[in-house]
Interface confidence: low
Amino acid sequence: EEELQVIQPEKSVSVTAGESATLNCTVTSLIPVGPIQWFRGAGPGRELIYNLKEGHFPRVTTVLDPTKRNNMDFSIHISNITPADAGTYYCVKFRKGSPDVELKSGAGTELSVRAKPSAPVVSGPTARATPEHTVSFTCESHGFSPRDITLKWFKNGNELSDFQTNVDPAGKSVSYSIRSTARVVLTRRDVHSQVICEVAHVTLQGDPLRGTANLSEAIRVPPTLEVFQRPMRAENQVNVTCQVRKFYPQRLLLTWLENGNVSQTETASTLTENKDGTYNWRSWLLVNTCAHRDGVVLTCQVEHDGQPAVSKSHALEVSAHQKEQCSDTTSGPVLAPTAPLGGSG
């Protein structure tokens, strides 16, 4: 009687995650009577994949009906393959008994799984930085196999070169992860800029995956201040304006001080947006020149996005003509008692 052989013709099979894998196995004899079982791995820790005799294996089906008496094909179909299914699969013949006794194993078929990388996720710095500073962006993608992968960084379509990339783990694994950190030098024009992380992998068939981050989340453009005065129609009033230019983000608190004393505070509203994404804002005061004292200094103090305040001062200029318009008895606050005292626009 010819000795029973268990034949697994393929040494290896490669399949894309989500697809089905067919693992072929034939036996040269149906004698002795007993079941065929499929295992992943060898030795005492091996994992049962399919048992012809009993059990419930939802993702595994036999290619042919194993209950047919003359069928010597015990090939199986595994559906919805995931990277966790990678490994070497053995077709094993048992002799019926209590317990069943292992007779012979096939040589094994190595199943490797090609798995797509997850959509790259780009994360930026936790705190905003100002132009000319360098910020780091991190890109992560997971779950791909095989290990070979290409990652590129772009800023507004231009490829970046200052980045460091790691693929983990270093050794053999069912799937891999990539993490890359790019360093980007901010400019004042970066409010509308975008960084893109692009991942190319054999499973993507030339159509790379992209993750993006907006530099608007990472940048703070500090304002520039300008304070000037203009005469008004009423000869005893002047308009003192604080022009706040080119700032981002919008969060801004402005305080007027008269000789160092707080006169009024306002939060920026009705901003005008510049083409580069930064904002402008102006705040103004009506000043009663008849109530002046010599050397009145008006200060515009701006706190932007929670940063330390910056300020610009202006010494009130009162012409001789304006002084003549005031009676000697006039007294009162420097700021005109209009409601509101100041305005913005």
């Epitope: 059990g55 419930h56 294996f57 939802p58 993702r59 919805n80």
Partner: antibody
Framework: EVQLVESGGGLVQPGGSLRLSCAAS????????MHWVRQAPGKGLEWVSA???????YYTGSVKGRFTISRENAKNSLYLQMNSLRAGDTAVYYC????????????WGQGTMVTVSS | DIQMTQSPSSLSASVGDRVTITCRAS??????LAWFQQKPGKAPKSLIY???SLHSGVPSKFSGSGSGTDFTLTISSLQPEDFATYYC?????????FGQGTKLEIK
């Protein structure tokens, strides 16, 4: 006989806490994925939470951050710690066993009623 | 999340009738679909798993079919004890989700 018995339900005020228990017998609870499923009065079934054999945990969106699933292998028991309870959590809570190979629900407990009301 | 839609929501039938309940998934769930039976005031009972496999002790008058997104539960010959609410459920990915239920009533 394979059996699951829930306990710990009751009346609790909104914002309050409750801990449900599920005692398993006839099988080793740690060898199975275990679940909590609830059913509001007159409504359908809603999956709430699961714990895998490796201790990995899963929650439906509405209970994330408020409920915690756990198990105690020595007592062969499953738990659901429910905090910051809301009226919408009022339901019968069932403890359910998942199948060995595919996690299909096979054994259900009799359920325990949780009422959240002031 | 994967949405499960059962139809009809309610169904009137007579003893001896053959009835079919359908369940549709909002995306492909392979064959990871289960059916449950629930009677008033009782816990649900597991009938079918992996779309067509009967749980131990479930009579063969219950059968399930389907794959991908469309599934059916068929009861071949209704008996008085079969009048209940039936739910389908996907368990391919978390969060597991149930259909809204089909109430089977005596005509």
């Amino acid at each position: 006989e394979v059996q699951l018995v829930e306990s710990g339900g009751g009346l609790v005020q909104p914002g309050g806490s409750l801990r449900l228990s599920c005692a398993a017998s006839g099988f080793t609870l740690s060898s199975y994925d275990m679940h909590w499923v609830r059913q509001a009065p007159g409504k359908g079934l809603e999956w709430v939470s699961a714990i895998g054999t490796a201790g990995d945990t899963y929650y439906t969106g509405s209970v994330k951050g408020r409920f915690t699933i756990s198990r105690e292998n020595a007592k062969n028991s499953l738990y659901l710690q429910m905090n910051s309870l809301r009226a919408g959590d009022t339901a019968v809570y069932y403890c359910v066993r998942g199948g060995v190979w595919d996690d299909a629900f096979d054994i259900w407990g009799q359920g325990t009623m949780v009422t959240v009301s002031s | 999340d994967i949405q499960m839609t059962q139809s009809p929501s309610s169904l009137s039938a007579s003893v001896g009738d053959r009835v079919t309940i359908t369940c549709r998934a909002s995306q492909d769930i392979n064959n990871y679909l289960a059916w449950f039976q629930q009677k008033p005031g009782k816990a649900p009972k597991s009938l079918i798993y992996t779309a067509s496999s009967l749980h131990s002790g479930v009579p063969s008058k219950f059968s399930g079919s389907g794959s991908g997104t469309d599934f059916t539960l068929t009861i071949s010959s209704l008996q008085p004890e079969d009048f209940a609410t039936y739910y389908c459920q996907q368990y391919v990915s978390y969060p597991y989700t149930f259909g809204q239920g089909t109430k089977l009533e005596i005509k």
